[in-house]
Interface confidence: medium
C-alpha cells in the first residue's frame, strides 16, 4: 500500500478535498487521530496499512510501466467513447436505447442490468474518475470480469476466479493487439458466492486503484497510456448486476 496524501494524489487539481473523498489518501498523516484509512460513504476507501493483506506483492513488484496521463487528450467532441473487442454485445441491454435518464448524478439505468453489460465511459477515463459497480455474486460462481476497453485492446482486465486449481485468485492483465501480457495475481479474495459486493475503481495518473466492499484491494499500473481512449467498461461473469456508475471526485 502506498502513503499518498490527498494533496499528492490530487496535486494541481485546485481542489484539496473534493466532495465525497476521505480527508486524506491512504493512511492518515501523523497527528490525524490515528484513524487509518478513513473513508466516507460513496468515497473510495482509504488504504489499509502496509502489509495488511497477506500475500500482497511488495511495492514495485508489478510489471507494466507506470505512465503519466497525457497532458492534452486527442481532439474530440462529445462524451461517449468507444469500446472493445465486441465481447459484450449491446443487444438487449437496457443502456442500448438511450431512453433512460441517469438514476442519480451518474450511471446506469435503475433496475437489474443484463450481464454482460457495457458501460460507456464518456470521453475515456481520467484521473479522479471513480467507477462503482454494485451486484451480487451468484451461487457457485466461477468468475467475474471487468474489462476497461480501448478499441480492441483491454487496458485493464480485473478477473476474480473462484476456482483456479481449487484456489481463489484475482488476475489482472492487459491485452494489446490480441495478446495478453504478464499476469498480476492477488491472493486476497474478498468475494463470496451468493453475497453482495461493491467494487470501486479509482483512476489515478499512473494506475488504477481497486477497492472491494470498502477495503483497498490492489493497484494496477497503467500499461495503456492513452487514458482518454479507454472508453467502455465491460462487466461480465457470474453476477447479478445492480448498478454500474461513475463520478469525478
Amino acid at each position: 500500500a502506498d502513503n499518498f496524501s490527498l494533496h499528492d494524489a490530487l496535486s494541481g487539481s485546485g481542489n484539496p478535498n473534493p466532495q465525497g473523498w476521505p480527508g486524506a489518501w491512504g493512511n492518515q498523516p501523523a497527528g490525524a487521530g490515528g484513524y487509518p484509512g478513513a473513508s466516507y460513504p460513496g468515497a473510495y476507501p482509504g488504504q489499509a496499512p502496509p502489509g495488511a493483506y497477506p500475500g500482497q506483492a511488495p511495492p514495485g513488484a508489478y510489471p507494466g510501466a507506470p505512465g503519466a496521463y497525457p497532458g492534452a487528450p486527442a481532439p474530440g467532441v462529445y462524451p461517449g467513447p468507444p469500446s472493445g473487442p465486441g465481447a459484450y454485445p449491446s443487444s438487449g441491454q437496457p443502456s442500448a436505447t438511450g431512453a433512460y435518464p441517469a438514476t442519480g448524478p451518474y450511471g446506469a439505468p435503475a433496475g437489474p442490468l443484463i450481464v454482460p453489460y457495457n458501460l460507456p465511459l464518456p470521453g475515456g477515463v481520467v484521473p479522479r474518475m471513480l467507477i462503482t459497480i454494485l451486484g451480487t455474486v451468484k451461487p457457485n460462481a466461477n468468475r467475474i470480469a471487468l474489462d476497461f476497453q480501448r478499441g480492441n485492446d483491454v487496458a485493464f482486465h480485473f478477473n476474480p476466479r473462484f476456482n483456479e486449481n481449487n484456489r481463489r485468485v484475482i488476475v489482472c492483465n492487459t491485452k494489446l493487439d490480441n495478446n495478453w501480457g504478464r499476469e498480476e495475481r492477488q491472493s486476497v479474495f474478498p468475494f463470496e458466492s451468493g453475497k453482495p459486493f461493491k467494487i470501486q475503481v479509482l483512476v489515478e495518473p499512473d494506475h488504477f486503484k481497486v477497492a472491494v466492499n470498502d477495503a483497498h484491494l490492489l493497484q494496477y499500473n497503467h500499461r495503456v497510456k492513452k487514458l482518454n481512449e479507454i472508453s467502455k467498461l465491460g462487466i461480465s461473469g457470474d453476477i447479478d448486476l445492480t448498478s454500474a456508475s461513475y463520478t469525478m471526485i
Epitope: 492534452a72 487528450p73 486527442a74 481532439p75 474530440g76 467532441v77 462529445y78 462524451p79 461517449g80 467513447p81 468507444p82 469500446s83 472493445g84 473487442p85 465486441g86 449491446s90 443502456s95 442500448a96 436505447t97 438511450g98 431512453a99 433512460y100 435518464p101 441517469a102 438514476t103 448524478p105 451518474y106 450511471g107 446506469a108 439505468p109 457495457n118 460507456p120 464518456p122 470521453g123 475515456g124 481520467v126 480501448r150 478499441g151 480492441n152 492513452k226 482518454n228 481512449e229 472508453s231 467502455k232 456508475s245 461513475y246 463520478t247 469525478m248
Partner: antibody, heavy 116, light 109 residues
C-alpha cells in the same frame, strides 16, 4: 490535424432514403465514439446517436431509433448514417462529431432537403 | 428525457466578462454530465470549446473557461472580444445519451 469531412448536400423526395457519410482523418478512428447531430433551420441541436467504430456498438436517441441507422467502414475510416422514410421534418443540416473528454472536432455539416 | 436549458441571449461589451449557464431538468449538473460547450458561427461553423466540464480544447483561447456554478454548468468568457459573437451550445451526458441546450446567442457590442 483532426478532420471530419462530410458528404455534399442532398435533395431527395419524400419517402425516400439517404445515406450521409463522414470521413475521419488525423486521429485514431477506432478510438472515439462518432456522434451524429441534427440542426433544423433556425432551431437548436438534436443528438441523433453515436457509434463506436471499433465494434459498431450504437446508442440512439429514442426519437431517432426508427429513423436513423449508423454504420462504419473501418477500412476507410468513414462513418455513415442512413435516414429512411424521409419527410419535410427531416430537412436539416446533419453533423458528425467525434467524442473525447476534451471538446474539439465537428464536420462541416451536410444539408439535406426533402422536397417533392 | 432530460431538458437542458440555457439563456436565450446575452449581450456584453469588449473586455467585459460574461457567464453563460446550462441547467438540467433532472437536478444539479455534476461532473459526470461531462458538460460540453460548443460555438456556432455563421455558415454552420462549429468549434468545440470545452469538454468534461472544464477542459479547454486545444487551440481555444484561455479567456474561455468551463465550471460548475451552483447546480448549473457555466461557460465564462473573460475579456470578451468582438469575434466571440456567436451562438454557444451546451450539451450534457446522461448515462448513455446526450442532450443539447437550446443555445445562447452572445452579442458583443
Amino acid at each position: 490535424q483532426v478532420q471530419l469531412q462530410q458528404s455534399g448536400a442532398e435533395l431527395v423526395r419524400p419517402g425516400a432514403s439517404v445515406k450521409l457519410s463522414c470521413k475521419a482523418s488525423g486521429y485514431t478512428f477506432t478510438g472515439y465514439w462518432l456522434n451524429w447531430v441534427k440542426q433544423r433551420p433556425g432551431q437548436g441541436l438534436e443528438w441523433i446517436g453515436m457509434i463506436d467504430p471499433s465494434d459498431s456498438e450504437t446508442h440512439y436517441n429514442q426519437v431517432f431509433k426508427d429513423k436513423a441507422t449508423m454504420t462504419v467502414d473501418r477500412s476507410s475510416s468513414t462513418a455513415y448514417m442512413q435516414l429512411s422514410g424521409l419527410t419535410s421534418e427531416d430537412s436539416a443540416v446533419y453533423y458528425c462529431a467525434n467524442s473525447n473528454y476534451a471538446s474539439g472536432s465537428w464536420g462541416q455539416g451536410t444539408t439535406l432537403t426533402v422536397s417533392s | 428525457q432530460a431538458v437542458v436549458t440555457q439563456e436565450s441571449a446575452l449581450t456584453t461589451s469588449p473586455g467585459e466578462t460574461v457567464t453563460l449557464t446550462c441547467r438540467s431538468s433532472t437536478g444539479a449538473v455534476t461532473t459526470s454530465n461531462y458538460a460540453n460547450w460548443d460555438q456556432e458561427k455563421p455558415d454552420h461553423l462549429f468549434t468545440g470549446l470545452i469538454g468534461g466540464t472544464n477542459n479547454r480544447a486545444p487551440g481555444v483561447p484561455a479567456r474561455f473557461s468551463g465550471s460548475l456554478i451552483g447546480d448549473k454548468a457555466a461557460l465564462t468568457i473573460t475579456g470578451a472580444q468582438t469575434e466571440d459573437e456567436a451562438i454557444y451550445f451546451c450539451a450534457l451526458w446522461y448515462s448513455n445519451h446526450l442532450v443539447f441546450g437550446g443555445g445562447t446567442k452572445v452579442t458583443v457590442l
